[in-house]
């Protein structure tokens, strides 16, 4: 767990889309695998904020026990608090569930800072503001943890939506989404719209406000503007993608594109920041500093430690550059770019701001485990995790924070050669050496 970096930080109506069409084999506009259009029952089913994670309401067991569960595309275990903890308002009580089955197996998940451990079992799980289905899923009942749960975050567990390869204790433990797709007619796709407030929210405001939407089994057109652009999922473990170019205010960082993906690039809703490999981070900060040189900030700000405050309503967004990440496209030698604003990478901090001040943390940080496109990136976009077609789609989010001069953007196509060379091939090592926490 890291302070406001890795979350947890490693900080309705029914109606399932049944009997849906499979993707058409056609060169015309490809049909998405899954219903398109309106998913009214799933819209606005997330709450939370980038610094503490976005969560969805789920029920576990019989009779159903309601819990708030962090949506995490950077891990693959469904794990819930199952014992009293000072930061938990409620927890999963296995003894009260007639459908709980013990797998008689433990699981231990260490992060860079902190850990959780628990006991594996299965139970019936459903998502009240999701598809109208119930599935039997693997559950890690967390009995002990350190620096995992976050005080005031209002979630009691984590829904790992990535692939089995990174599940703990090993890839034989089927992740929740795999179980859902296998046991129901829900298409193998989900999409996320994370809505950053753009201003600090206190705890009661978070509870009352909308945090976004997780559309299970499809795409909702009301959640984005413009077109969806897709990038291939390079390998099904994390949601790994390939970045082929980075620009700050249109200025190319001019690095070997392998550096951008060293040792991987992933899309991770459970991480707060945009995290960049050391060399890339240093180059990006140098460029952002140069672009915003009309004002000077302390070193601690660029390290994500110190806050910068302006009088309420006077934040000089215009002095900060836009950041563009070019992603490999679906067509050979074709890429597209996603562009975020300072409104995404300067994260409002609630516990310090007052009515007189707007305070922000710099939400781009250094990584030793590759690029992580965390909540600050995802808050600009509607992101489609099209597992069926092994691709991730990006479109401008209908809820992204912007100003009258600039907006987040998804644009293409651009001609980019030799994009395959941008991927880094991680040397094969014993799987147990995989880092769980992203430092």
């Amino acid at each position: 767990t890291q302070h406001g970096i890795r979350l947890p930080l490693r900080s309705g109506l029914g109606g399932a889309p049944l009997g849906l069409r499979l993707p058409r084999e056609t060169d015309e506009e490809p049909e998405e695998p899954g219903r398109r259009g309106s998913f009214v029952e799933m819209v606005d089913n997330l709450r939370g904020k980038s610094g503490q994670g976005y969560y969805v309401e789920m029920t576990v067991g019989s009779p159903p026990q309601t819990l708030n569960i962090l949506v995490d595309t950077g891990s693959s275990n469904f794990a819930v608090g199952a014992a009293p903890h000072p930061f938990l308002h409620r927890y999963y009580q296995r003894q009260l569930s007639s459908t709980y089955r013990d797998l008689r197996k433990g699981v231990y998940v260490p992060y860079t800072q902190g850990k959780w451990e628990g006991e594996l079992g299965t139970d019936l799980v459903s998502i009240p503001h999701g598809p109208n289905v119930t599935v039997r899923a693997n559950i890690a009942a967390i009995t002990e943890s350190d620096k995992f749960f976050i005080n005031g975050s209002n979630w009691e567990g984590i829904l790992g939506l990535a692939y089995a390869e990174i599940a703990r204790p090993d890839d034989s433990l089927e992740p929740f989404f795999d179980s859902l797709v296998k046991q129901t007619h829900v298409p193998n796709l989900f999409s996320l719209q994370l809505c950053g407030a753009g201003f600090p929210l206190n705890q009661s405001e978070v509870l009352a406000s909308v945090g976004g939407s997780m559309i299970i089994g499809g795409i909702d057109h009301s959640l984005y503007t413009g077109s969806l652009w897709y990038t291939p999922i390079r390998r099904e473990w994390y949601y790994e993608v390939i970045i082929v170019r980075v620009e700050i205010n249109g200025q190319d960082l001019k690095m070997d594109c392998k550096e951008y993906n060293y040792d991987k690039s992933i899309v991770d809703s459970g991480t707060t920041n945009l995290r960049l490999p050391k060399k890339v981070f240093e180059a990006a900060v140098k460029s952002i500093k140069a672009a915003s040189s009309t004002e000077k900030f302390p070193d601690g700000f660029w390290l994500g430690e110190q806050l910068v405050c302006w009088q309420a309503g006077t934040t000089p967004w215009n002095i900060f550059p836009v950041i563009s990440l070019y992603l490999m496209g679906e067509v050979t030698n074709q890429s597209f770019r996603i562009t975020i604003l300072p409104q995404q990478y300067l994260r409002p901090v609630e516990d310090v701001a007052t009515s007189q001040d707007d305070c922000y943390k710099f939400a781009i940080s250094q990584s030793s485990t590759g690029t992580v496109m965390g909540a600050v990136i995802m808050e600009g976009f509607y992101v489609v995790f099209d597992r069926a077609r092994k691709r991730i789609g990006f479109a401008v989010s209908a809820c992204h924070v912007h100003d009258e001069f600039r907006t987040a953007a998804v644009e293409g196509p651009f001609v980019t050669l030799d994009m395959e060379d941008c991927g880094y091939n991680i040397p094969q090592t014993d799987e147990s050496t995989l880092m769980t926490g992203r430092a």
């Epitope: 000077k296 302390p298 601690g300 110190q306 806050l307 310090v352």
Partner: antibody, heavy 120, light 108 residues
């Protein structure tokens, strides 16, 4: 070594503008590593931050004084200045100039201070 | 804005005694806290920064500790020249505008 020295009138009439200058000697005000600030201390009271400036002209002001304060820099003279308009007796204080690091962002070097009395 | 509360307001001690000064922040300031010493008629002088690092030329009898909201300045054995007013300041938020109200260390 680097030193800071405040200068300016010790007496200002109410409603007038207080003007002070801080001269930096033994080093350059154009260092990219520092801001240059003003802090004041009313007699027998605590410290109040007024504002600061970077050699390029970028400024930060205390919101409670912002409407009355102007800080400017003259790199050719290695000086920075404070102007506080529409003064009242409540502005009577010892005014200090100081250096603020961007690496270690504290006031690591101070001038001796100059007492400014607002009185008719 | 973050408020810094220093206690006690006055500390009456004899030379050679240990002085313990407290500074409490209304919200966490991480380790971004400094201590200054101010003698009568003089400008403040930076003693400790980043909660526990001694500034250049500061004697080893001065030490700082704490993080988050609670901080302590300790003078292990008071020398006659240590009787002064001590201020804490947070720079967790930029610009660095918040000082504590001060603690006066006087001779008993």
């Amino acid at each position: 070594q680097l030193q800071l020295q405040e200068s300016g009138p010790g007496l200002v009439k109410p409603s007038e503008t207080l003007s002070l200058t801080c001269t930096v000697s033994g080093g350059s005000i154009s260092s990219s590593s520092y801001y240059w600030g003003w802090i004041r201390q009313p007699p027998g009271k605590g410290l109040e931050w007024i504002g600061m400036i970077y050699y390029s002209g970028s400024t930060w002001y205390n919101p409670s004084l912002k409407s009355r304060v102007t800080i400017s820099v003259d790199t050719s003279k290695n000086q920075f200045s404070l102007k506080l308009s529409s003064v009242t007796a409540a502005d009577t204080a010892v005014y200090y100039c100081a250096r603020v690091g961007l690496g270690v962002s504290y006031f690591d070097l101070w001038g001796r201070g100059t007492l400014v009395t607002v009185s008719s | 804005e973050i408020v810094l509360t220093q206690s006690p307001a006055t500390l009456s001690l004899s030379p050679g005694e240990r002085a313990t000064l407290s500074c409490r922040a209304s919200q966490s300031v991480s380790s971004y806290l400094a201590w200054y010493q101010q003698k009568p008629g003089q400008a403040p002088r930076l003693l400790i920064y980043d909660a526990s690092k001694r500034a250049t030329g500061i004697p080893a009898r001065f030490s700082g500790s704490g993080s988050g909201t609670d901080f302590t300045l300790t003078i292990s054995s008071l020398e006659p020249e240590d009787f002064a007013v001590y201020y804490c300041q947070q720079v967790y938020t930029w610009p660095p505008r918040t000082f504590g109200g001060g603690t006066k260390v006087e001779i008993k």
